[in-house]
């Protein structure tokens, strides 16, 4: 049994880091493998992650971590029984993938303005709370070419757009994702999408 693709990990910079790897053949990850991880810190204890299958030869492990900060560095040991298959390290702050925003809502009752709001996925005491920026994707269910991205570079998790910038009388969907420049993160996953019917009063032509 050998590791074909070494584990790569990303952290949500809050409580979970996700590591994925591939074996050289079909593997029952949860029964055959264990990923041990330990913070390089005084008094830290080793923890064991039981991986799940992610395709035939792929494995994924969700590592639980408390109080993630820049100074943290973890050792990782991948075991098959008594055999050490791979040894590495992981610095969560250097591989951050933010949590996806939630509770995306479209408010359509504001005088021909669409107000989109969503929730910041981090608590106020997490460093990323004040450092997320967002991308909002809006698309038409009827017209695949009607697809747009709005970059929200301010901290407030909301976006206002004129309803008239979208076509009237058709349904649209929106979703939002986040990233943080301070840690050069990847984009989060997209939030679940929300749907609304866009209708507004056409301006009366003189």
């Amino acid at each position: 049994m050998k590791v074909l693709q070494e584990p790569t990990c990303v952290s949500d910079y809050m409580s979970i880091s996700t590591c994925e790897w591939k074996m050289n053949g079909p593997t029952n990850c949860s029964t055959e493998l264990r990923l041990l991880y330990q913070l390089v810190f005084l008094l830290s204890e080793a923890h064991t992650c039981i991986p799940e299958n992610n395709g035939g030869a792929g494995c994924v492990c969700h590592l639980l971590m408390d109080d993630v900060v820049s100074a943290d560095n973890y050792t990782l040991d991948l075991w098959a029984g008594q055999q050490l298959l791979w040894k590495g390290s992981f610095k969560p702050s250097e591989h951050v993938k933010p949590r996806a925003p939630g509770n995306l809502t479209v408010h359509t009752n504001v005088s021909d303005t669409l107000l989109l709001t969503w929730s910041n996925p981090y608590p106020p005491d997490n460093y990323l709370y004040n450092h997320l920026t967002y991308a909002v994707n809006i698309w038409s269910e009827n017209d695949p070419a009607d697809f747009r991205i709005y970059n929200v570079t301010y901290l407030e998790p909301s976006l206002r757009i004129a309803a008239s910038t979208l076509k009237s009388g058709i349904s649209y969907r929106a979703r939002v994702r986040a990233w943080a420049q301070c840690y050069n993160t990847t984009w989060s996953e997209w939030s679940p999408s929300t749907k609304w019917h866009n209708s507004y009063r056409e301006p009366f032509e003189q």
């Epitope: 204890e45 109080d67 820049s70």
Partner: antibody, heavy 116, light 111 residues
Framework: QVQLVQSGAEVKKPGASVKVSCKAS????????MHWARQAPGQGLEWMGI????????SYAQKFQGRVTMTRDTSTSTVYMELSSLRSEDTAVYYC?????????WGKGTLVTVSS | QSVLTQPPSVSAAPGQKVTISCSGG????????VSWYQQLPGTAPKLLIY???KRPSGIPDRFSGSKSGTSATLAITGLQTGDEADYYC????????????FGTGTKLTVL
Amino acid sequence: QVQLVQSGAEVKKPGASVKVSCKASGYAFTSYYMHWARQAPGQGLEWMGIINPSGGSTSYAQKFQGRVTMTRDTSTSTVYMELSSLRSEDTAVYYCARGKWWLYNWGKGTLVTVSS
Amino acid sequence: QSVLTQPPSVSAAPGQKVTISCSGGSSNIGNSYVSWYQQLPGTAPKLLIYDNNKRPSGIPDRFSGSKSGTSATLAITGLQTGDEADYYCGTWDTSSPPQPIFGTGTKLTVL
């Protein structure tokens, strides 16, 4: 919100021991290390040691080795710091502080006076 | 005794900017992250800066930290009378066994 409530002031005689408590609330007690530091009157901060509330393991500053004992009670989310063989130079405010690489939250401090 | 050296005192007028230095060595600041603590008179220390330059929520952006080599600096802009306090730098000494260490402390007086 996070709170660290320390026990009240103590007056001790040289050679005696003192046990200071620090009750934590507002967070997962076993998920965060707890440090102890002290500050003599008009002086700076001095680190004494650290305890991992999860397993109870400890590490002490060399200066206090053999004289200090840190323990925890997970049922009450409380950590304790006991200092023995007290001398006048141990007169100080003793602080518990939650954190790992740095100390996020501090208790209000417990004044321990050592006087004959 | 502390191996992180700070000036004993600094002073400036309200609205001005002040910096407080913290000098260490390769076994501490040079190889670890720096934090800063504010201790108002008669109170416990409070975390002001961690990770060299990050502020906990609730700390105004008038406070900033930086690190270069084996020294670190705390800068306070737009000084207010309420900033009058003792300030301590902190880091980890990576010699064996590793342990946190604090600076000697700096008394800030707002004139």
